[in-house]
């Protein structure tokens, strides 16, 4: 149940896909990855107001309980709904290999 | 990659399963659910410090970039890794039905 995509907080303030440029050093990968030297990391950032992109029933419950008990129950959180695969050229004991990672780059986002 | 389960912030402070008692009124279900009158809602609450219960590579990246750019990139978030099913007796146009929901109660938690 992907609820409303209208952000009541204003354009770009709610949970959505952002791109953050990061070097191998930024990611702590310099010692085991050769390429790419820089990654366009796609990640999910933004607020999750009531029913915005609610991933499921649990997210809806969380919204209701957060409204009642904000100090106890946090608001839903903006996280990846799916991922795009990515390859890395990584160092091995004997040289290099090309490895695919399926859980590295967010493809789209929801609130949970 | 479920990384370290040791919480550096002290016992119970990091991402884990909590139970929150909620009435049908609390959940906004009173108009369509007959039973149960009260639900022991299991949900994921707590901080996600560096590499604590990191769900995948994306969570590890998020930790690294949050450390570098805390104002831009949020820390990983404590969310359900899986769910327990739950049945609700719900009102229908003609009476009641027993419906199973697979995405209502968190079973265990991770950081993403």
């Amino acid at each position: 149940a992907r609820n409303g995509d209208h952000c009541p907080l204003g354009p770009g303030r709610c949970c959505r896909l952002h791109t953050v440029r990061a070097s191998l050093e930024d990611l702590g990968w310099a010692d085991w990855v050769l390429s790419p030297r820089e990654v366009q990391v796609t990640m999910c950032i933004g607020a999750c107001p009531s029913q915005f992109r609610a991933a499921n029933m649990h997210a809806q419950i969380k919204t209701s309980l957060h409204r009642l008990k904000p100090d106890t129950v946090p608001a839903p959180c903006c996280v990846p709904a799916s991922y795009n695969p990515m390859v890395l050229i990584q160092k091995t004991d004997t040289g290099v290999s090309l490895q695919t990672y399926d859980d590295l780059l967010a493809k789209d986002c929801h609130c949970i | 990659a479920r990384n370290g389960d040791h919480c550096p912030l002290g016992p119970g402070r990091c991402c884990r399963l909590h139970t929150v008692r909620a009435s049908l009124e609390d959940l906004g279900w009173a108009d369509w659910v007959l039973s149960p009158r009260e639900v022991q809602v299991t949900m994921c609450i707590g901080a996600c410090p560096s590499q604590f219960r990191a769900a995948n590579m994306h969570a590890q990246i998020k930790t690294s970039l949050h450390r570098l750019k805390p104002d831009t990139v949020p820390a990983p978030c404590c969310v359900p890794a899986s769910y327990n099913p739950m049945v609700l007796i719900q009102k229908t146009d003609t009476g009641v039905s027993l419906q199973t929901y697979d995405d209502l109660l968190a079973k265990d938690c991770h950081c993403i």
Epitope: S35, Q40, N84, P85, V87, I89 | -
Partner: antibody
Framework: QVQLQESGPGLVKPSETLSLTCTFS??????????VGWIRQPPGKGLEWIAH???????YFNTALKSRLTISKDTSKNQVSLKLSSVTAADTAVYYC??????????WGQGTLVTVSS | DIQMTQSPSSLSTSVGDRVTITCKAS??????VAWYQQKPGKAPKFLIY???YRYTGVPDRFSGSGSGTDFTFTISSLQPEDFAVYYC?????????FGQGTKVEIK
Amino acid sequence: QVQLQESGPGLVKPSETLSLTCTFSGFSLSTYGIGVGWIRQPPGKGLEWIAHIWWNNNKYFNTALKSRLTISKDTSKNQVSLKLSSVTAADTAVYYCARMGYDIMDYWGQGTLVTVSS
Amino acid sequence: DIQMTQSPSSLSTSVGDRVTITCKASQDVNTAVAWYQQKPGKAPKFLIYSSSYRYTGVPDRFSGSGSGTDFTFTISSLQPEDFAVYYCQQHYSTPWTFGQGTKVEIK
């Protein structure tokens, strides 16, 4: 496992357009960092890189051939197409496509011989 | 475009011998040189990445070194299946360019 196969006409007349297709399996051209490149080898000669296309649709071409080249991809069909216009006898070669991960060309097709002759 | 010049163009050698091929770039390419092996009628096979890194599954008798403009490819002890043509290629910048090849023949 990764496999690539080139297909083309075999024989092309001078001044016509050569159309080649690379059909692949075992990887996806929607994966960040993945590309498909074309390389050719005239009979008895060395290798010449022609062009490549990336997952994000960025394209790069051999400087000398650039004005005659078109490259495109169909991610859903796992295919990359190359077109070379205004061919001459000098374009006679075995044409290979190769899977690329950044600057690694690790898997190659078996090649297809294209002869330019009237 | 960056030119890659290989030497020698061919060499005759025997099983068990050590073989060294050199490749010179027309400008600094850092360590961005790859090496390929090609047997008659077959597609090239990727051997070495970024001057010195053996690709997955490549036997350790194959090695590479160098940076800047001068690069070396070595087969420490030639095996019967190693008789082939070897190419260097710069992957520093497009257009990617290959050396003209070195044919390793049986003496």
